[in-house]
Each structure stands twice: as structure tokens, then as C-alpha cells.
Amino acid sequence: ESLGTEQRVVGRVAEVSGPEPSQQEQLVFGSGDAVELSCPPPGGGPMGPTVWVKDGAGLVPSERVLVGPQRLQVLNASHEDSGAYSCRQRLTQLVLCHFSVRVTDAPSSGDDEDGEDEAEDTGVDTAGAPYWTRPERMDKKLLAVPAANTVRFRCPAAGNPTPSISWLKNGKEFRGEHRIGGIKLRHQQWSLVMESVVPSDRGNYTCVVENKFGSIRQTYTLDVLERSPHRPILQAGLPANQTAVLGSDVEFHCKVYSDAQPHIQWLKHVEVNGSKVGPDGTPYVTVLKTAGANTTDKELEVLSLHNVTFEDAGEYTCLAGNSIGFSHHSAWLVVLPAEEELVEADEAGSVYAG
């Protein structure tokens, strides 16, 4: 039973809805934190209902697991809440966002955004200098994360009057324009968020919390680990097997992920003197599509066949290579007789309605 069209439509949904989910985001939370995951719809288009899935199983909302459009909150997290989370389009199971969540016994300096600190602030009656409200969550002074991940530094504090918070990088004032992609300063959560970190984000980050009675500071060290180079990764299930009617149009899709610039080719397997492979075992192929001067990667990810004939039936391969190596996925095209022929073949036991 061919699952071809199923996987193909997922690929097409991705095209309509905007970019594929980025590299899996890795987040670390402390025990007792509120895990909050956000997944805005790619492309902003209507996506229909979504569902959050943890380790392959759909998450059921409860008093502790709160769901809303594009958002998941797991309150009072424990080690059991660690795992692979994904936000999926409910209808197709298309993955919109990936998260790898780790809940450690030691509370994290991660931004749990649980709002508890704001509530504590209101309870400060006596005038006084700033102080840390969650010092136990600030133990993790050194953070090492892979490139492309999101980093959150947090300095939950209180004081009367309510102190201000500012951030330094390597001892100098740190503002959004200092990095590509900017930064998110969430003053109510006393946090600094940097998305999609790169090696140039390495350094010492200091939060400075002050009011008229005093000032406190905390320094975190960020190390960004280079992503390990690898050959292109091809999305599972693409291209997908397809069945088409004679004379119709067909599209094969191939989704390629590669840090290094990939080179994509579409090949069709052919027979030479009745053989599909050469003496050395290498398959005989003909190149249908390859990078040209005006061809974009996006165009190369789709192979279009127009007005298919029976000769078009066979095996097609998407081949992607970069400086590290090659990857390839194949799919089959089956071509059926046209509708008119089916109707004419009534005596043979086939009828076509519509």
C-alpha cells in the first residue's frame, strides 16, 4: 500500500505555510520551573487546529499542562517532563516546531516565564536595595549550547522601589543592534533571550539590577558549540511514491537540509541493454534536473513532470551533495491508463465514474 500521496501533501503544506521548522530547539529547565513553549504558525497563514506531542504521544491538557493556540505550558516541571516536544498541525501531523526539553534537578537560569516573580515583587513593602528572589535558579553560571539554539539568561529580583534591569556583554552595554537577530529583553521576567545563537555570541553576560538603594549583578558565561558538519539530510518520506493517470502532471518533492551549500540533482533510473546497473553495480541514470545559472534551491527541490506517458513510469532519485558527502532518496512513479480508456475497457471489468 503506497503512502506516497500522504507524504507528498505534507511537503506541500510546508511550502504553503512557510519555512520548515528550524533545527530542534534545545531547552533546559530546572525542577519546579514552568516549561513554556511557543510555536507561532509559519507564514502566518491559517493552519487549522494544532496539537502538542511529547515523545510521540499527544499531550492531554490538564491542570498542570496548559495548551492554547501555538503555546504549551507545563507547570511545576519534573524530570518526567523531559523529552522531545513538537507542535504539529492536527490535521496532517506536519511538524511546525521541535523542542528538546530537559528538566534537571538543579534549578536552571533558564527563562521559565512562569510569572511567579512578579507576584513576589508586589509583596515588598519596606524600602530597600534589590535582592535576588530566586538565587537557587541562578547557580548555572556557564551555559554551553549548540549553534542555532535559543538561550535565556534570567536574574529574578525584587526591591522597593522596583529595580531596573540592564545587560552587559563582556562588561559593555548590550543592545539588540549588537547582534544579528537582535535580543528580547523581558523586564517583567528579568530575562534576556537570544534566538539562533552563533559563535560570535560567546562571552560573559551580566545582568545589572539596581534601584536608588543599591545595585546587584550576576554574570553568566555563554559558550556556543559549532554545529558538526554533515552531508545533506533529506526529509523522510520525500520524494514519495506516486500514481498518476496518463497525460496528467506529477510533482516529486525533495526537502534538503544542509549547513554547507548543497548541490541537488534529479535522476531517472534507466535500462541499458536490458540492465539497470553497470558492470560495477552503479545504476544507470539520466540527469533530469540540476543546478543552472538561474535555478534556485527551492526550484530544485521540486521535479515537475508534465503530460506523463507510460515511458515516464519508473524510479526517480533526488541526489543532494555538499562538501562532506552525498545523500539520496528515491521514489517510484506508476502511470495508469487514462479515464477514457478505462471506460472503453468496460468489458474487461472497469468502470470510471465522474
Epitope: P46, G48, G58, Q70, R88, L91, T92, Q93
Partner: antibody
Amino acid sequence: EVQLLESGGGLVQPGGSLRLSCAASGFTFSSYDMSWVRQAPGKGLEWVSGIYSGDGSIYYADSVKGRFTISRDNSKNTLYLQMNSLRAEDTAVYYCAKDAPTNEMSRFDYWGQGTLVTVSS
Amino acid sequence: QSVLTQPPSASGTPGQRVTISCSGSSSNIGNNYVSWYQQLPGTAPKLLIYADSKRPSGVPDRFSGSKSGTSASLAISGLRSEDEADYYCASWDYSLSGYVFGGGTKLTVL
């Protein structure tokens, strides 16, 4: 065994209200998305509304938007459809339909036997 | 008028293969899965095919689904008298933010 039992149908005048119930058993009701689908006499199927547990979202067909409200009571394993400002064209058999597990492709894998709603003066 | 278009009727003799088409657009079939439902006279609909071509357990392999572009089709091979029923295709429609059904095809086994 999965069972869906609709009730609450009957004869109502145009402009009137009716509340349909669907009692579910044989599965963990709170974990599943549910929908109402109707079928006018001698006509085809028409999806009316769906309630999605995965993100708490609710959707309605344009033909009932603003008049019908879908809801659920997980403690009672019951799905509801509150129908207000009823019109003659709302006359139909109303089916309660269970969706597949939320980590699978959506489809209506179980249906109730339906309850007939007649809107007539 | 239904958003998904099906032929109102189809027929065949026992043993034959019948195909029912379902035509939509890029906002539904073109970018979403199609499911098919069988409704025997006087009964509730029953799921026949989902995710374009998958069969739930218990559905005979005589029933198969396929899709190309914005059209889907249901094929029934080795037609039997008990296959006489109404058949509906369905898909989510992004522009309408809801499920849409085809108008239904009444299959007659001659």
C-alpha cells in the same frame, strides 16, 4: 468498544433552541477531538463544528457560526451542541463523530447513530 | 453546492472495478489529506479511507484511495452487492477553517 449516543433531537419552531448531547464510552474521551456532522433528509453530509483538545480550539461551519455552540464536559464524557436561532434549513440528522488520536492524521473513525432535529412551524 | 465535487452516481456490475472521483482546490485537497466514508442505507457513515490512501483495520483491500494534485479518487475492485451505498470524500479546508464533504456519490450495483 467505542460507543457514541446522541440525544436531544426533536421538533422545534423556527427561531427556537435545542441542545444536543453525545454520550461517549469505550475510550478516554478527554484525549480526543470531537465533531458534529449533520445530514439533511435526502442530502449529503455537512460538517457542523469541531472541538480540538490539542490546543483548545473550536471551529464552526459558516452556516452555523454565531448560532451554534459546541462544548464538552470531560467529567461526564459528553459532547454538546447548543443550537439557537434555528432555521428550517437546520433540519437534519445530527451525528456525533470521534476523531482519531491527536498524534495521528485527522479522520472521523467512529460515528454515533444520529439524532433527528426538525425545525418547522 | 458542495466545496468538493463528486459525481452524483456511479454504477457497476458485480466483480467490476469502479472509481469515484472527488475534485477540490489547493485550499483543501491540494494541501490536506482526504478521507472517504461509506454510508449504507439507513445507517451512520463509516470510515473507509483516510490520509488519502490508508485503510483502517477491517476495511477490505478491495477499497483503495489515491490522490493527484487537487483531485482524489476512491477505487472499489471486485464490486459486491453489499457495496451499494453512498460514498463521501472529505478534507479540511484552510480558507474556510473547517471540514468539507463532497456531495456524495450513490453507487448502484447492477
